[in-house]
């Protein structure tokens, strides 16, 4: 469960892949599309509002206990729109929604080496936002093998 309905802090950052491709957002036919692309040097990077939440981590052993704390985030590139996990389609989409946000808009934030982070679906543990064919997608990760996979590593820069 998320401890508070208010974020503990918020920040604006641009989002890029491990390989320094930018995550951009474009309004097309009244809906937003998400792109992973090389930006021209003079082009300004899109910013995302990251809202951080403190959350309880459920105990995986007992099933009903609590095993400490974790940080969750929501990502909003523009007012009233949030990144959401579509677990059925294994896709990442931008949806307009009102608060309280649905669980699909929350991602566990993982601190990774090389100054990178990863975003794990709250609704589907072990599934992360990743890059596939120049798009964002949901990627299932085996903890014991692929947590360092470059395609689920992202950089946040102010």
């Amino acid at each position: 469960s998320i401890t508070g309905i208010s974020p503990i802090t918020e920040s604006l950052a641009s989002l890029s892949t491990y390989n320094d491709q930018s995550i951009t957002f474009a309004l097309e036919d009244e809906s937003y599309e998400i792109y992973v692309e090389d930006l021209k040097k003079d082009k300004k990077k899109d910013k995302v509002l990251l809202s951080y939440y403190e959350s309880q981590h459920p105990s995986s052993e007992s099933g009903d206990g609590v095993d400490g704390k974790m940080l969750m985030v929501t990502l909003s590139p523009t007012k009233d729109f949030w990144l959401q996990a579509n677990n059925k389609e294994h896709s990442v989409e931008l949806h307009k929604c009102e608060k309280p946000l649905p669980d699909q808009a929350f991602f566990v934030l993982h601190n990774r080496s090389f100054n990178c982070v990863s975003f794990e679906c709250k609704t589907d543990p072990g599934v992360f936002i990743g890059v596939k064919d120049n798009h964002l997608a949901l990627i299932k990760v085996d903890y014991s093998e692929n947590l360092g996979s470059e395609n689920i590593l992202f950089k946040l820069s102010e």
Epitope: T9, E10, S11, G68, K69, V108, S113, Y143, S144, G148
Partner: antibody
């Protein structure tokens, strides 16, 4: 209940070797980053080494680089610290610590095991 | 490396009093908009216990009398009303970058 139990400490001569173990229980070990933190007698805390979940990355404090190796065996739920070329200044209680889920801070600590390097 | 300096080294107070502990970093411990500064409590013969993470968030099972504040380089741990079990050594620690570093500690003792 989440538990970390260290073992393997003891008295060793300068230049000697020791291997510390940390047996973890009560959580999915492979999902968590693990670390060793030490505390010299009557002194403060010093981070020693970290290994990520999935064994992908390791990091060490400069003073132990090339001498200490952190490793893990996820099938045995055990964390290790192989300590070679030990020096008097390595004398300390060594704590096994587990990061929180997401790897942002040291959340769970073992009781520690004492390593004494002396001739 | 980031050096953390805690003050005072020792704080002599009575139960029921308010304790204010300071931690100053040699450079900002902010990353991704988070202040990656944590506080631990350690009693003699025991391992440290997480009190506060990310500057102001209480760890699991930590009483509300413990609170953290601050950003950038200056941080404070406040114990609103000291209980007998609160007399201990308190450490701040940064998790912004390797090497992860701790302050030298503040001992809160009974006056």
């Amino acid at each position: 209940e989440v538990q970390l139990v260290e073992s393997g400490g003891g008295l060793v001569q300068p230049g000697g070797s020791l291997r510390l173990s940390c047996a973890a229980s009560g959580f999915t070990f492979s999902s968590f980053s693990m670390s060793w933190v030490r505390q010299a007698p009557g002194k403060g805390l010093e981070w020693v080494a970290t290994i990520s979940g999935g064994k992908t990355f390791t990091d060490y404090v400069d003073s132990v680089k090339g001498r200490f190796t952190i490793s893990r065996d996820d099938s045995k739920n055990t964390l290790y610290l192989q300590m070679n070329s030990l020096r008097a200044e390595d004398t300390a209680v060594y704590y096994c610590t587990r990061a929180n889920y997401g790897n942002w801070f040291f959340e769970v600590w073992g009781q520690g095991t004492l390593v004494t390097v002396s001739s | 490396e980031i050096v953390l300096t805690q003050s005072p080294a020792t704080l002599s107070l009575s139960p029921g009093e308010r304790a204010t502990l300071s931690c100053r970093a040699s450079e900002s411990v902010a990353k991704y908009g988070l202040s990656l500064l944590n506080w631990f409590q350690q009693k003699p013969g025991q391992p440290p216990r997480l009190l506060i993470f990310a500057a102001s968030n209480r760890g699991s099972g930590i009483p509300a009398r413990f609170s953290g504040s601050g950003s950038g380089t200056d941080f404070t741990l406040t114990i609103s009303s000291l209980e007998p079990e609160d007399f201990a050594v308190y450490y701040c620690q940064q998790s912004k970058e390797v090497p992860f570093t701790f302050g030298q500690g503040t001992k809160v003792e009974i006056k």
